[in-house]
């Protein structure tokens, strides 16, 4: 079965220290938790977490992100999952690409981290 | 010309108290965060606390937190620490720095000495 | 805590030689990482932020390369006032944390 992967449209923010949820889900909703879910960052593609046979897969991480990471999976079973990152760094702004993998079929999201200055931030309004 | 005086250092007793100041000129004060780093003698730079332009976001090492308080009063131009529950571990010179997470102006520093 | 690790912890040198400190962030810092000299019973002085941008009013001899763990800093040719030591700091995120220090003696 196909499906489209969605995120978050805007620009997601956060202040550094702090912890930010990064939404994804699929299109048509329907149980991912057979599926391979990740994130990586572009262009290098440094896996940012990986969810694969179940189980979340420490050992494929990139170091910057190692323990610091959860995968927010209460609504696997309709395709909808959040990537937690905990202890915002400025290092961790700019793009991260969301994938799901059933089999040999995959399709991806791109959304994008602002990270602010806590030091220098201005509550809005 | 930036200039940053830091006062208050001494002798205290542990478990006792003692509270910091630096006074800032050359700057506006009000426009930037600011910081205070350590150095125990004969050691390396250590990261003490920050504080936000405004005063209302605040961040301390693990090693100080809960017992040291950063603040300031811009009226009056000056960065503050208060420190309570003093350790002999605490005894170091103490820096008050310009910025948050990069240090482009420092004082001459303050002795902290912790002993009975 | 990212931990920042410096090499050599001390160096000997000549006045109008080429000196190079390194710095190895523990996981990757993007281009966060600063430099900073220090001369005994001185506060510390900002040489180089943002990894390889010169602090205004800093001598041209000294340079910062390196991004992700990796850096170094240059001091093109010693001059007898570069006799410090220096300071590597990471600056992506809390708590901030400074490597141990590199002390450039006279030889």
């Known amino acids: 079965g196909q499906f489209r992967v969605i995120g978050p449209r805007h620009p997601i923010r956060a202040l550094v220290g702090d912890e930010v949820e990064l939404p994804c889900r699929i299109s048509p909703g329907k149980n991912a938790t057979g599926m391979e879910v990740g994130w990586y960052r572009p262009p290098f593609s440094r896996v940012v977490h990986l969810y694969r046979n179940g189980k979340d897969q420490d050992g494929d991480q990139a170091p910057e992100y190692r323990g610091r990471t959860e995968l927010l999976k209460d609504a696997i079973g309709e395709g909808k999952v959040t990537l937690r990152i905990r202890n915002v760094r400025f290092s961790d702004e700019g793009g991260f690409t969301c994938f799901f993998r059933d089999h040999s079929y995959q399709e991806e999201a791109a959304m994008e981290l602002k990270v602010e200055d806590p030091f220098y931030w201005v509550s809005p309004g | 010309e930036v200039q940053l005086l830091e006062s208050g250092g001494g002798l205290v007793q542990p478990g006792g108290s003692l509270r910091l100041s630096c006074a800032a000129s050359?700057?506006?004060?009000?426009?930037?965060?600011m910081s205070w780093v350590r150095q125990a003698p004969g050691k390396g730079l250590e990261w003490v606390s920050s504080i936000s332009t405004s005063g209302s976001y605040t961040a301390y090492a693990d090693s100080v937190k809960g017992r040291f308080t950063i603040s300031r009063d811009n009226s009056k131009n000056t960065l503050y620490l208060q420190m309570n529950s003093l350790r002999a571990e605490d005894t170091a010179v103490y820096y008050c720095?310009?910025?948050?997470?990069?240090?482009?102006?420092w004082g001459q520093g303050t002795l902290v000495t912790v002993s009975s | 805590d990212i931990q920042m690790t410096q090499s050599p912890s001390s160096l000997s040198a000549s006045v109008g030689d080429r000196v190079t400190i390194t710095c190895r962030a523990s996981?990757?810092?993007?281009?966060?990482l600063n430099w900073y000299q220090q001369k005994p019973g001185k506060a510390p002085k900002l040489l180089i932020y943002?990894?390889?941008t010169l602090q205004s009013g800093v001598p041209s001899r000294f340079s910062g390369s390196g991004s992700g763990t990796d850096f170094t800093l240059t001091i093109s040719s010693l001059q007898p006032e570069d006799f410090a030591t220096y300071y590597c700091q990471q600056s992506d995120g809390n708590p901030t944390t400074f490597g141990q220090g590199t002390k450039v003696e006279i030889k």
């Open positions: 720095a310009k910025g948050g997470y990069t240090f482009d102006y």
């Open positions: 996981q990757s810092i993007s281009s966060y």
């Open positions: 050359g700057f506006t004060f009000s426009s930037y965060a």
């Open positions: 943002s990894a390889s």
